[in-house]
């Protein structure tokens, strides 16, 4: 059951009127512009910023008073500032939307350490992970290690955004006190909606009488 | 008042091509989304195109799909439809019609008196 | 693509009479039905849309009703300016007419 609250001074649930929130949106996906209504009765108009106003066509895009325009598969014509209109007893109301593409491009993935990894037992493992891609993409890092079912790493995760063509992911595993069980193959994966790439290092663990 | 004159209708051979225009006054035609729609001889209404009023986005039903295309000028007040590949199942009246905003959905509210086009050897 | 079927595609009527035309969709509508009235050498003129909504300016004599897949249209206290040819659209998913009702005087 959806229950419509009526309010002829409010006719969309939530108004942006003022600064747009942001809707992350991907090309080819569904896109919801949600100015939902407080009365299915509210004709509600949708208009791309500078000087078009979108058909809604029962088909790619839909109006549903209690979700909004729902886009079926967006494109870059939907890029930008979206406002949806309304006008209830002679006052026009408006609530802003501000699309921003996210792309799934994964320009780079590395392990900034050396090739296998040799390491004393007991001491510490810190393994770097860096992922680039452009500006306008957001990624999923994670790993697989020898003895990941006891949860042994402990993961940092940082952004850099200071470079003005790329994004710059990093994921720092740390294990402390590295026993013989960890020696093996350590793998960072890096996820962007369908895109995906991995890098790996081995990882050997010697006692101080082998060095 | 709303006006819509369409224009350009003729006499062409099948696999011809022609051009209708919709020249229209009386409301911001720069604000609305606008139509093509004919009537076919035996009295049917077919819609054959749409364009919104910024002219980013068209539609059109399979059935001229390819071989139609709607386009306007915001600055002349005018409306076109670029008709190409013309077969004699074309042979209609062709409507312009605006576009208005009725519960969300668009219906065509204002239409022109027509143009004909005859598709026939 | 949604199918309209509407009926009858003639009536005869007298004046002051009513008539009822319908229009079927094969799938529902969600009330985004629209009528009008087409007169020889002219534009279809909109009466009423959203399935029972009049445009301003049209007489209270003409209605409209429905949901779903079934909606009507109807004239009561018929005259002679009426005498025209009547057609349905539904307007949810692209646009699609119905095929017309020719009303002609009995």
């Known amino acids: 059951i959806y229950i419509f609250i009526s309010d002829t001074g409010r006719p969309f649930v939530e108004m942006y009127s003022e600064i747009p929130e942001i809707i992350h949106m991907t090309e080819g996906r569904e896109l919801v512009i949600p100015c939902r209504v407080t009365s299915p009765n509210i004709t509600v108009t949708l208009k791309k910023f500078p000087l078009d106003t979108l058909i809604p066509d029962g088909k790619r895009i839909i109006w549903d008073s209690r979700k909004g325009f729902i886009i079926s598969n967006a494109t870059y014509k939907e890029i930008g500032l979206l406002t949806c209109e309304a006008t209830v007893n002679g006052h026009l109301y408006k609530t802003n939307y501000l699309t921003h593409r996210q792309t799934n491009t994964i320009i780079d993935v590395q392990i900034s350490t050396p090739r296998p990894v040799k390491l004393l037992r007991g001491h510490t493992l810190v393994l770097n992970c860096t992922a680039t891609t452009p500006l306008n993409t957001r990624v999923q890092m994670t790993w697989s290690y020898p003895d990941e079912k006891n949860k042994r790493a402990s993961v940092r995760r940082r952004i850099d955004q200071s470079n003005s063509h790329a994004n710059i992911f990093y994921s720092v595993l740390t294990i402390d006190k590295m026993q013989n069980k960890d020696k093996g193959l350590y793998t960072c994966r890096v996820r962007s909606g369908p895109s995906f790439k991995s890098v790996n290092t081995s990882v050997h663990i010697y006692d101080k009488a082998f060095i | 008042e709303v006006q819509l004159v369409e224009s350009g209708g003729d006499l062409v051979k099948p696999g011809g091509s022609l051009k209708l225009s919709c020249a229209a006054s009386?409301?911001?035609?720069?604000?609305?989304?606008m139509s093509w729609v004919r009537q076919t001889p035996d009295k049917r209404l077919e819609w054959v195109a749409t364009?919104?009023?910024?002219?980013?986005?068209?539609y059109y039903p399979d059935s001229v799909k390819g071989r139609f295309t709607i386009s306007r000028d915001n600055a002349k007040n005018t409306l076109y439809l670029q008709m190409s590949s013309l077969k004699s199942e074309d042979t209609a009246m062709f409507y312009c019609?605006?576009?208005?905003?009725?519960?969300?959905?668009?219906?065509?509210?204002?239409w022109g008196q027509g143009t004909s086009v005859t598709v026939s050897s | 693509d949604i199918q309209m079927t509407q009926s009858p595609s003639s009536l005869s009527a007298s004046l002051g009479g009513k008539v009822t035309i319908t229009c079927t969709t094969s799938?529902?509508?969600?009330?985004?039905i629209a009528w009008y009235q087409h007169k020889p050498g002219k534009g279809p003129r909109l009466l009423i849309h959203?399935?029972?909504t009049l445009q301003p300016g049209i007489p209270s004599r003409f209605s409209g009703s429905g949901s779903g897949r079934d909606y009507s249209f109807s004239i009561s206290n018929l005259e002679p300016e009426d005498i025209a040819t009547y057609f349905c659209?539904?307007?949810?998913?692209?646009?699609?007419f119905g095929g017309g009702t020719k009303l002609e005087l009995k």
């Open positions: 364009i919104t009023s910024g002219g980013s986005y068209t």
């Open positions: 959203y399935a029972s």
């Open positions: 019609a605006r576009l208005g905003n009725y519960g969300g959905y668009y219906a065509m509210d204002y």
């Open positions: 799938q529902d509508s969600n009330n985004y």
């Open positions: 659209l539904q307007y949810d998913y692209l646009w699609t």
């Open positions: 009386g409301f911001t035609f720069s604000s609305s989304g």
